[in-house]
């Protein structure tokens, strides 16, 4: 059967019918419903929400909706023994204590089970000592302090501002520097946009607001106790000492009112330059320790959180494909939140809910997608992408054989300025073509396409007249699908103007103030940006599941491979003498990229010409497209990161949120001038060039004519 016979509606009409069915008012209603109480992973409230979503997805018309549960390691504060930080005098008396909770927002004063701010998976401990301010606690910040300024963090408690990089990387860096504790805080320079009021009068962070978050360094492992395998009923669990990615020193987050009290007393060295200064009225001295009059005072942390194996629940909905039921297009986003989840994740979950409803409506009218669509409401994303990773581990054999694409659906908004897309190069043309067909919601772009407003507001740095599309990094549920399994992935949301707003993320991220009202009053009163994101995410899923030929363009991969090869070569060429000494050549990589480019070009020509009415040939060509992303997977993984297996992309070793290209080569070159054994270090560079060149060549060959 052709696709049209199978679906009973012409393809063009299908997409329009699907998009027209999406309603802003429904997304608003769903968001409200999902945000009235906290839905912390592992709690009864989040289990009840899972069952509610299961029930509603069934009502919407999905073929089946199941709960998939796992018993994973989570972390909670001790209800009777709260976490806090003190300044103590020479007698050990606590002369200042940080707050134990965030002042609740108006209307939520009587809500129970609001988890106080904490750093998930912090070990217990009560370290005391001198404070060192380490800026953002990035790799380069510790290099500046320790290598350049000779300021030793060993045995110190470090205080770092949130922003720029994933908090887990900050903690890892602090541990490597020998710190015995970490205090994380939100500086107004990063979380308070000028000219905007703090919540509840605006979308800025108040002084008592605190960002929660996990501080793991899982590197894609999922549940820390069952790396590589699902945390099911018969799982073998590691001992806590062997668990993956747990921090070894106590960590705690605070707001800027409390940070002011710690930072205003800092002595020792001045900050190295103005980039280390935030917006508080303090000198931002680095330390170590407090200044003159306060030099006998110390900082003490009191951390009593516990790690507990707890049951979590994913909701997995299936809409069976009419023609290729064994080909899966997945739309997934998480359900668990730190508190109310007004933006993260429920602005995304509400969009998924409406997409499911629209697909269900079409199905009830007799339509089916060509391929199977799986919908997922993931649990425990906030605790390390645990729900999605455990499910993918459990279903890895199916996914690696049948997975066409994964579209992520966390927060729909982090601003209301323009679209933001991160995806595999295979999806560039899909995203371009789709956004050209959608209306822009932006003021001043009435009657114009989304593509036009997006391109104007966020232009590509390389190609004029095109929008910026970023590399996938991590920090969200696409990680296991893309970085481990090699399934083509993408994500889309509305974002802020990065040029004018330098704060990190959005100010109220992971705080108690991330409420329904935050979205409805300040970000998207008409829910028009949510609707646009629903159209982009839903439209991508529709096309991926329904187009006769998969909407992947392998030529776009060729273009970026050349760009990434040029970039990594230029990094290496900062060491021309060593490259000569150790005979380092990138010829094999450039040759492989050239071959890939030529083969991709020929494949694209064949894709235009082949007989689409021949189901065997159609399936063959589609399989070559589907398996191209898979071809970039190295079964051995990256050095010391076995679950990051994609050779072209991996989360940066210095910032989990950011994507790095040719990560194996990049990491081998990083800080190579400081390596004690240069011969060994440059040998590893050569090995990584070999792995990359082989992988690109091997991937190219999957696109060659099969015989």
């Amino acid at each position: 059967k052709s696709s049209n016979e199978a679906t009973n509606i012409t393809p063009k009409h299908n997409m329009k019918a699907f998009l027209d069915e999406l309603k802003a008012e429904n997304i608003k209603k769903f968001l409200y419903n999902f945000t009235q109480i906290p839905h912390l992973a592992g709690t009864e409230q989040n289990f009840q929400l899972a069952k509610q979503i299961q029930s509603q997805w069934k009502e919407f018309g999905l073929d089946s909706v199941e709960l998939a549960h796992y018993d994973v390691l989570l972390s909670y504060p001790n209800k009777t023994h709260p976490n806090y930080i003190s300044i103590i005098n020479e007698d050990g008396n606590e002369i200042f204590n940080t707050s134990l909770f965030e002042p609740p927002p108006p209307g939520y004063e009587n809500v129970s089970d609001i988890v106080p701010p904490f750093s998930a998976f912090s070990p217990q401990g009560m370290p005391e000592g001198d404070l060192v301010y380490v800026n953002y606690a990035r790799t380069e910040d510790f290099f500046k302090l320790e290598r350049d300024m000779k300021i030793n963090c060993s045995g110190k408690i470090v205080i770092a501002r949130y922003g720029k990089v994933f908090r887990g990387n900050k903690v890892k860096n602090a541990q490597l520097a020998g710190a015995k504790g970490v205090i994380l805080y939100s500086d107004p320079a990063d979380y308070f946009a000028p000219g905007v009021k703090s919540y509840p009068d605006g979308w800025n962070l108040p002084g008592g607001g605190v960002q929660r978050g996990n501080i793991l360094n899982l590197n894609g492992a999922g549940d820390p106790l069952t790396p590589g395998y699902p945390a099911n009923e018969y799982a073998y669990r590691r001992g806590i000492a062997e668990a993956v990615g747990l921090p070894s020193i106590p960590v705690h987050p605070i707001g800027y009112y409390d940070a002011q009290k710690l930072l205003e007393k800092m002595g020792g060295s001045a900050p190295p330059d103005s980039s280390w200064r935030g917006s508080l009225k303090v000198p931002y001295n680095v330390g170590p320790g407090f200044t003159g009059n306060f030099s006998t005072q110390k900082v003490k942390m009191h951390i009593h959180s516990t790690n507990e194996v707890t049951r979590i629940y994913n909701v997995i909905g299936t809409l069976r494909g009419a023609v290729e039921p064994d080909r899966y297009v997945i739309l997934g986003g998480h359900r668990d939140s730190w508190v109310f989840g007004g933006i993260d994740p429920q602005s995304g979950a509400a969009v998924v809910h409406e997409i499911v409803r629209s697909f269900g409506t079409l199905k009830k009218e007799g339509w089916r997608p060509r391929r199977t669509i799986l919908f997922a409401s993931w649990d425990a994303e906030e605790f390390g992408l645990l729900g999605s990773t455990e499910w993918a581990e459990e279903n890895s054999r199916l996914l690696q054989e049948r997975g066409v694409a994964y579209i992520n659906a966390d927060s729909s908004i982090e601003g209301n300025y323009t679209l933001r897309v991160d995806c595999t190069p295979l999806m560039y043309s899909l995203v371009h073509n789709l956004t050209k067909e959608l209306k822009s919601p932006d003021e001043g772009f009435e009657g114009k396409s989304l593509y036009e407003s997006w391109t104007k507001k966020s232009p590509s740095p390389e190609f004029s007249g095109m929008p910026r599309i970023s590399k996938l990094g991590s920090g969200n549920d696409f990680e296991v699908f893309f970085q481990r399994l090699g399934i083509a992935s993408g994500r889309a949301r509305y974002t802020k103007n990065w040029e004018t707003n330098k704060f990190s993320g959005y100010p109220l991220y992971h705080s108690v103030y991330e409420t329904y009202e935050l979205v409805e009053k300040f970000y998207d009163p008409m829910f028009k940006y949510h609707l646009t994101v629903a159209q982009v995410r839903g439209g991508m899923v529709f096309e991926l599941a329904n187009s006769i030929v998969l909407p992947f363009d392998c030529r776009d991969y060729a273009v970026v491979l050349r760009k990434y090869a040029d970039k990594i070569y230029s990094i290496s060429m900062k060491h021309p003498q060593e490259m000569k000494t150790y005979s380092v050549s990138f010829d094999s990589l450039f040759s492989a990229v050239k071959n890939f480019t030529e083969i991709a070009s020929k494949f694209s020509e064949r894709l235009q010409d082949f007989d689409k009415s021949n189901p065997i040939v159609l399936r063959m060509m589609n399989d070559q497209l589907m398996f191209l992303e898979r071809a970039f997977i190295d079964p051995l993984g990256l050095p010391d990161r076995p679950f990051y297996r994609h050779v072209i992309y991996a989360p940066s070793s210095h910032n989990k949120y950011a994507g790095e290209s040719f990560p194996g080569i990049y990491d081998a070159l990083f800080d190579i001038e400081s390596k004690v054994d240069p011969s060994k270090a440059w040998g590893e560079v050569k090995r990584q060039i070999y792995v990359a060149a082989f992988t690109v060549q091997a991937a190219a060959e999957t696109l060659s004519e099969v015989a």
């Epitope: 000779k150 001045a270 103005s274 200064r277 000198p283 001295n285 680095v286």
Partner: antibody
Framework: EVQLVQSGAEVKKPGESLKISCKGS????????IGWVRQMPGKGLEWMGI????????RYSPSFQGQVTISADKSISTAYLQWSSLKASDTAMYYC????????????WGQGTLVTVSS | GIVMTQSPATLSVSPGERATLSCRTS??????LAWYQQKPGQAPRLLIY???SRTTGIPARFSGSGSGTEFTLTISSLQSEDSAVYYC??????????FGQGTELEIK
């Protein structure tokens, strides 16, 4: 008591080389940056560069980069400032000073070494 | 680099009077400013650091204020031994630092 004691005054001819010294005592010499400051006759203070005696890491002011060499011998708690070829314009008082902290003011100063370069 | 401008170049004040010395920087340096006193034939002596913190042993009549780009050294009740050249210095852009051109304070 923290002390920085500098070597005595020098009179040199243009083109000659010179190495002046600054010996620290009363504190952990390897744990603090030592800086050199020039004061030309009747003029103000000019920062030349700093050294961390613990590992001899050295940083220069762009104005003095390539003109002078700063070094240290931690075994005898001494920092040095040297010229390979003096010029008449190098005539000045040279002070060594300890940095209170990595990025911080100079809290202790040597008594100064007067260098006179004249043909 | 950061340019330091001190004013006035010279200041003449009677004993017991207040002397106010100014230092302006070409860009914001937070509180990362020090004041030194240098008497003829002597090495400079640190008076104030962190814009307002007095070094141990410095009399209370010396006080510093300001932040960002505008800084002031105030000597509340001038004494004859306060006759000297006063320098401000920033230490905001590690490892760089620079001094102002100095203010000569003379006692009438």
């Amino acid at each position: 008591e923290v002390q920085l004691v500098q070597s005595g005054a020098e009179v040199k001819k243009p083109g000659e080389s010179l190495k002046i010294s600054c010996k620290g005592s009363g504190y952990s010499f390897t744990s603090y940056w030592i800086g050199w400051v020039r004061q030309m006759p009747g003029k103000g203070l000019e920062w030349m560069g700093i050294i961390y005696p613990g590992d001899s890491d050295t940083r220069y002011s762009p104005s003095f980069q390539g003109q002078v060499t700063i070094s240290a011998d931690k075994s005898i708690s001494t920092a040095y400032l040297q010229w390979s070829s003096l010029k008449a314009s190098d005539t000045a008082m040279y002070y060594c000073a300890r940095r209170m902290a990595a990025a911080g003011p100079f809290d202790y100063w040597g008594q100064g070494t007067l260098v006179t370069v004249s043909s | 680099g950061i340019v330091m401008t001190q004013s006035p170049a010279t200041l003449s004040v009677s004993p017991g009077e207040r002397a106010t010395l100014s230092c302006r920087t070409s860009q914001s340096i937070g509180w990362n400013l020090a004041w030194y006193q240098q008497k003829p034939g002597q090495a400079p002596r640190l008076l104030i650091y962190g814009a307002s913190s007095r070094t141990t042993g410095i009399p209370a009549r010396f006080s510093g204020s300001g932040s960002g780009t505008e800084f002031t050294l105030t000597i509340s009740s001038l004494q004859s031994e306060d006759s000297a050249v006063y320098y401000c210095q920033h230490y905001d852009n590690w490892p760089m630092c620079s001094f102002g051109q100095g203010t000569e304070l003379e006692i009438k």
